[in-house]
């Protein structure tokens, strides 16, 4: 008789990434009988919630329920009804909410409370909404990419299952860039982590990892831009800001009140003799780069070496996966290829920033102007952060891999977060068992 396939015995999990600029919902799926195996969980859906990040709802919390509806309904459709009640839902909020909490714990708590009540209305197993720490964000991003790259698997393979695999068990470092913060996480080579706040110890699949991580709040690409504008407007002679980080011919009016609406610009705050100013782009990469470098305080370091702002950073070690906005921005600029050297990236950024705004708008007609206008700044910022902030060099640049997805799953903290909360990464190596017989009869 012919073997007949049984109904697949699978499980699902949902994680919402409540970032500073938007919220994304991820649905993960895995075979129920292989929960402790490495690399079995994969992403089946990503749903981007329409609208801003949840921190922007602070004065209109009653709108949060409607905001989340479309993506939660999408999850209802994707996950079989029979699985709804046992599908865990987690929401993690990142730097946008960390910034709101700096202003008021109550305000952040009120937003999360409404989020929790909204998510509890769905038939899933809601497990809570919380603001994750920058350390967690870095750690879970590192776990995600190494899990997907098969770095935790003890089985050596003669073939490569993923494009970045160097076929050894050396873990990749993780570089994550968001709108409000950026994280750097890696295993240093035999280096003492001099600052306890930056040290993590993991035991995963029977192996110990001593991991360095730091999250730079206010150094995500959006908050870095606000910082730069607040810094530069201090020395402007009038309400015109000639800005090298925007294309020649670009013009935009900024409200001073919006500029100072974030804790990230407090250090540059001053009384200005105008309520608004106009950005006028001049499109000069080198000047833009110089302006960005002024955001990094490299004059003070209480350790053997630092990134910037007095934060310890060990010598860089091994390969790095750069994801989230590192990837999105470089992908737009067509600079993600492994073959593009750092010098070539810099050259291309010089040319891109110098292109007139009208020309750029024509070349990228399908892209929203708000986003399109900021790629010169964002690309320059990424180079500045990686080279001067984290001390990558022209030589070590080739160890940075700009990654969007690995094996169909987005690189980011959400998968690592779910793996941890569902106890799917064992401390010890599971005993190897014969191939499961349960799939076919």
């Amino acid at each position: 008789t012919q073997n007949k396939a049984l109904p697949e015995n699978v499980k699902y999990g949902i994680v919402l990434d409540a970032g500073s600029s938007h919220t994304s919902l991820y649905i993960y799926k895995w075979p129920a009988e292989k929960e402790n195996d490495t690399g079995v969980v994969h992403q089946v859906e990503e749903c981007r919630v329409k609208g801003p990040g949840i921190s922007k709802f602070v004065q209109k919390v009653n709108e949060i329920g409607i905001y989340l509806t479309d993506c939660m309904e999408r999850a209802r459709e994707v996950i079989p009804r029979s699985q709804h009640q046992e599908t865990p839902v987690y929401l993690g909020a990142t730097a946008g909410m960390r910034l709101l909490r700096m202003e008021s714990e109550e305000l952040a708590d009120r937003v999360l409370d409404v989020v929790e009540r909204s998510l509890s209305n769905y038939p899933f197993d809601f497990q809570g909404a919380r603001i994750i720490t920058g350390q967690e964000e870095g750690a879970y991003g590192w776990i995600t990419i190494n899990y997907l790259l098969g770095k935790f698997s003890q089985k050596t393979r003669w073939f490569s299952i993923v494009p970045y695999e160097t076929n050894n068990q050396e873990t990749f470092g993780a570089l994550d860039l968001g709108g409000a913060s950026t994280q750097v996480t890696f295993v240093p080579q035999n280096q003492t982590i001099e600052s306890p706040d930056n040290a993590l110890q993991f035991r995963l699949y029977g192996k110990d990892y001593n991991v360095y991580t730091h999250s730079f709040l206010c150094y995500g690409k959006d908050q870095a831009l606000w910082q730069k504008l607040a810094k530069d407007i201090q020395v402007a002679s009038n309400e015109i800001l000639r800005d090298p980080c925007f294309h020649p011919g670009y013009k935009k009016v900024v409200n001073v009140s919006d500029l100072y609406k974030t804790p990230c610009t407090k250090r540059f705050e001053m009384t200005l003799p105008f309520q608004q100013f106009e950005i006028q782009g001049i499109g000069n990469y080198q000047q833009c780069h110089q302006s960005i470098l002024e955001l990094f305080n490299t004059s003070y370091c209480p350790y053997s070496q630092c990134a910037f702002n007095g934060i310890f950073l060990p010598p860089l070690q091994g390969d790095f996966g750069a994801f989230s906005a590192f990837y999105f921005v470089m992908k737009f600029l067509n600079l993600t290829s492994e073959k593009v050297s750092q010098e070539k990236v810099t050259e291309m950024m010089k040319k891109f920033c110098a292109q007139p705004w009208e020309e750029i708008k024509t070349s990228y007609a399908g892209v929203k102007e708000k986003y399109l206008s900021e790629y010169c700044f964002s690309g320059t910022y990424i180079l500045s952060l990686l080279l001067q902030g984290y001390h990558f060099t022209a030589d070590s640049w080739e160890h940075i891999h700009f990654i969007g997805k690995i094996q169909g799953s987005d690189a980011g903290w959400t998968l690592g977060y779910m793996l941890n909360l569902t106890n799917m990464i064992p401390a010890e190596q599971p005993l190897s068992t014969p191939l499961s017989h349960s799939t076919y009869v």
Partner: antibody, heavy 123, light 105 residues
């Protein structure tokens, strides 16, 4: 030492306007949310308006919404309350008050209060 | 608005323990705070977030509760504690209780 000094009070006719000021010293002004709270003679405390440390959250009591405007000038360490269309029930001692902090996070409780400035609305 | 209900007055003897209650019309988590106001003076923060003692406040003062029911306890009461005590919630836009007047026998 934290000090909050209110000014600008006085006697005003119903329907008229008045602007209160509060000069802060002894702390980094732009790191704290600020508020106006009032107390009618012989009565309890009534929160009037809040302005968070950045301008993320500006909020008013329903009794003053649309008539009063809270603002701050961080470089001058000064908080303001612009009051328009004043009514007799706005008669009160107006306190300038600082938000507290829960460790590194802002809090909507009130840890330092000025001496208060009297506003009397009467014809 | 979240309404806070306090008993209007209490009279105790010095050296005794007194508890002043505050009930919220809806849950306010632990976002309840307590103030002392003496005649002719501005209010003074005593307790924040239900149970945390404010800087410079004697350890005779303590706070407890969460959700809707909160208590300010003074043990032992001293003559200088004659004042009106207000509770305030910050889970929603701030509201105060009407105050409890503490008098010493």
């Amino acid at each position: 030492e934290v000090q909050l000094v209110e000014s600008g009070g006085g006697l005003v006719q119903p329907g008229r306007s008045l602007k209160l000021s509060c000069l802060a010293s002894g702390f980094t002004f732009n790191n704290y949310g600020m508020n106006w709270i009032r107390q009618a003679p012989g009565k309890g405390l009534e929160w009037v308006a809040s302005f968070s440390s950045s301008s993320t959250y500006i909020s008013y009591a329903d009794t003053v919404k649309g008539r009063f405007t809270i603002s701050r000038e961080n470089a001058k360490n000064t908080l303001y309350l612009q009051m328009t269309s004043l009514r007799s029930e706005d008669t009160a001692l107006y306190y300038c008050v600082r938000h507290g902090r829960y460790g590194g996070y802002g809090g909507f409780y009130f840890d330092y209060w000025g001496q208060g400035v009297m506003v009397t609305v009467s014809s | 608005d979240t309404v806070l209900t306090q008993s209007p007055a209490l009279a105790v003897s010095p050296g005794e323990r007194v508890s002043i209650s505050c009930r919220a019309s809806e849950g306010v988590k632990s976002y309840m705070h307590w103030y002392q106001q003496k005649p002719g003076q501005q209010p003074k923060l005593l307790i924040y977030k239900a149970s945390n003692l404010a800087s410079g406040v004697p350890a005779r003062f303590s706070g407890s509760g969460s959700g809707t029911d909160f208590t300010l306890t003074i043990d032992p009461v001293e003559a200088d504690d004659t004042a009106t005590y207000f509770c305030q919630q910050s889970w929603n836009d701030p509201t105060f209780g009407a105050g409890t007047k503490l008098e010493l026998k």
